[in-house]
């Protein structure tokens, strides 16, 4: 990153070089020589989504005009280092990881957007972005400081499978019970139906006062 600043100063100062001593011009011309190191930047912390997906940007300051770039994601946990995934791409082309890779990514200039999926709590660790400028020579290597990815597994309900079975059984029982009740009620109503009924509301006076509560004051005959 600093290298870009040095080059910018060089461009601005070159306007005035005619009035400056040759030694200064010589010095300015050679400033870029001290800026060859490649620097890689990535976020310090990222929290994975509840679905176990984490995304972060890996940005590098390219010292040369690279046409072939290799990006590798390394995981460091308990001083153990493992390669998570890697992809080589041509500048201007899309970044493609292997089919079985847990990583996907897109590239835009000197920036790579990385997505790691299928993460679980045990995958929490430092994920380091390693960038290599493969072609043309010379080869350049840059390694980021790492992104600490935190993965929290979603808390499952206690005995969720068991509760699901209970819920299914109760629901099924209620459904069949209501089905049976409806069937019985309908059959009783059909038996009681008189062939003389016209389908209008008819006032039914009680025959015995003490039994009044056993009958509805109105009923709707069903055709």
């Amino acid at each position: 990153m600093a290298c870009l600043g040095f080059q910018r100063h060089k461009a601005q100062l070159n306007l005035a070089t005619r009035t400056w001593p040759c030694t200064l011009l010589f010095f300015l011309l050679f400033i870029p020589v001290f800026c060859k190191a490649m620097h890689v930047a990535q976020p310090a912390v990222v929290l994975a989504s509840s679905r176990g997906i984490a995304s972060f940007v890996c940005e590098y300051a390219s010292p040369g005009k690279a046409t072939e770039v290799r990006v590798t994601v390394l995981r460091q946990a308990d001083s153990q280092v493992t390669e998570v995934c890697a992809a080589t791409y041509m500048m201007g082309n899309e970044l493609t990881f292997l089919d079985d890779s847990i990583c996907t990514g897109t590239s835009s200039g000197n920036q790579v957007n990385l997505t790691i999926q299928g993460l679980r709590a045990m995958d929490t660790g430092l994920y380091i972005c390693k960038v290599e400028l493969m072609y043309p020579p010379p080869y350049y290597l840059g390694i980021g400081n790492g992104t600490q990815i935190y993965v929290i597994d979603p808390e499952p309900c206690p005995d969720s499978d068991f509760l699901l079975w209970i819920l299914a059984a109760v629901s099924s029982g209620l459904f069949f019970y209501s089905f049976l009740l409806t069937a019985v009620s309908l059959s009783k109503m059909l038996k009681k139906r008189s062939p003389l009924t016209t389908g209008v509301y008819v006032k039914m006076p009680p025959t015995e006062p003490e039994c009044e509560k056993q009958f509805q004051p109105y009923f709707i005959p069903i055709n």
């Epitope: 020589v33 060859k36 190191a37 280092v81 020579p137 350049y140 840059g142 390694i143 400081n145």
Partner: antibody, heavy 118, light 108 residues
Framework: QVQLVESGGGVVQPGSSLRLSCAAS????????MHWVRQAPGKGLEWVAV????????HYADSVKGRFTTSRDNSKNTLHLQMNSLRAEDTAVYFC???????????WGQGTLVTVSS | EIVLTQSPGTLSLSPGERATLSCRAS???????LAWYQQKPGQAPRLLIY???SRATGIPDRFSGSGSGTDFTLTISRLEPEDFAVYYC?????????FGPGTKVDIK
């Protein structure tokens, strides 16, 4: 544990050729870049060459460019250094070394001595 | 190529003393791409520090590395008898990779 064993060293005449080999074990050979580093008697370390994990890329020190070629056989866990047009100044102990994930050399073999003398 | 210069050439110290070794690069080196190695007579080198300041597996915490840009330092806080050896710095950020000429730490 990681083991690297070099072989093929010996005494040769200037202008002749020699092929060094390095047998690797104790790690996934096909996942690591491999280096050759040499050390002239009583002198310091000099980096010679590197080959990528899959053999796709190779880089050499200016002093050996065009004369030395490194190759690898991942099926046999073996690394090679073909040395042509040997000079007296190529006399050294040649170390085979593993490239770590972070790019540095993390494990070394014990070395094999190459003497170029008439 | 990047030229690495180490100083001093020889460092004469007693066990228990602090050793400070310097490595200077001819041009800027990414701090993530500088390593330190220890070599004892008749043995292969051993990785001590990588990425300028990260200790390799199994390296005691008396060894520490620091620096950035063109100036890097290896510090041995308290010299143990087994620490008397030659120390090399190496840059692996730009090809060709290069080693420094080494600093010999010997017993005073």
């Amino acid at each position: 544990q990681v083991q690297l064993v070099e072989s093929g060293g010996g005494v040769v005449q200037p202008g002749s050729s020699l092929r060094l080999s390095c047998a690797a074990s104790g790690f996934t050979f096909s996942s690591h870049g491999m280096h050759w580093v040499r050390q002239a008697p009583g002198k310091g370390l000099e980096w010679v060459a590197v080959i990528w994990y899959d053999g796709s890329n190779k880089h050499y020190a200016d002093s050996v460019k065009g004369r030395f070629t490194t190759s690898r056989d991942n099926s046999k866990n073996t690394l090679h250094l073909q040395m042509n047009s040997l000079r007296a100044e190529d006399t050294a102990v040649y170390f085979c070394a593993r490239g770590g994930y972070f790019g540095c050399v993390d494990y070394w073999g014990q070395g094999t001595l190459v003497t170029v003398s008439s | 190529e990047i030229v690495l210069t180490q100083s001093p050439g020889t460092l004469s110290l007693s066990p228990g003393e602090r050793a400070t070794l310097s490595c200077r690069a001819s041009q800027s080196v990414s701090s993530s791409c500088l390593a330190w190695y220890q070599q004892k007579p008749g043995q292969a080198p051993r990785l001590l520090i990588y990425g300028a300041s990260s200790r390799a597996t199994g390296i005691p915490d008396r060894f520490s590395g620091s620096g950035s840009g063109t100036d890097f330092t290896l510090t041995i806080s308290r010299l143990e008898p087994e620490d008397f050896a030659v120390y090399y710095c190496q840059q692996y950020g730009i090809s060709p990779f290069t080693f420094g000429p080494g600093t010999k730490v010997d017993i005073k």
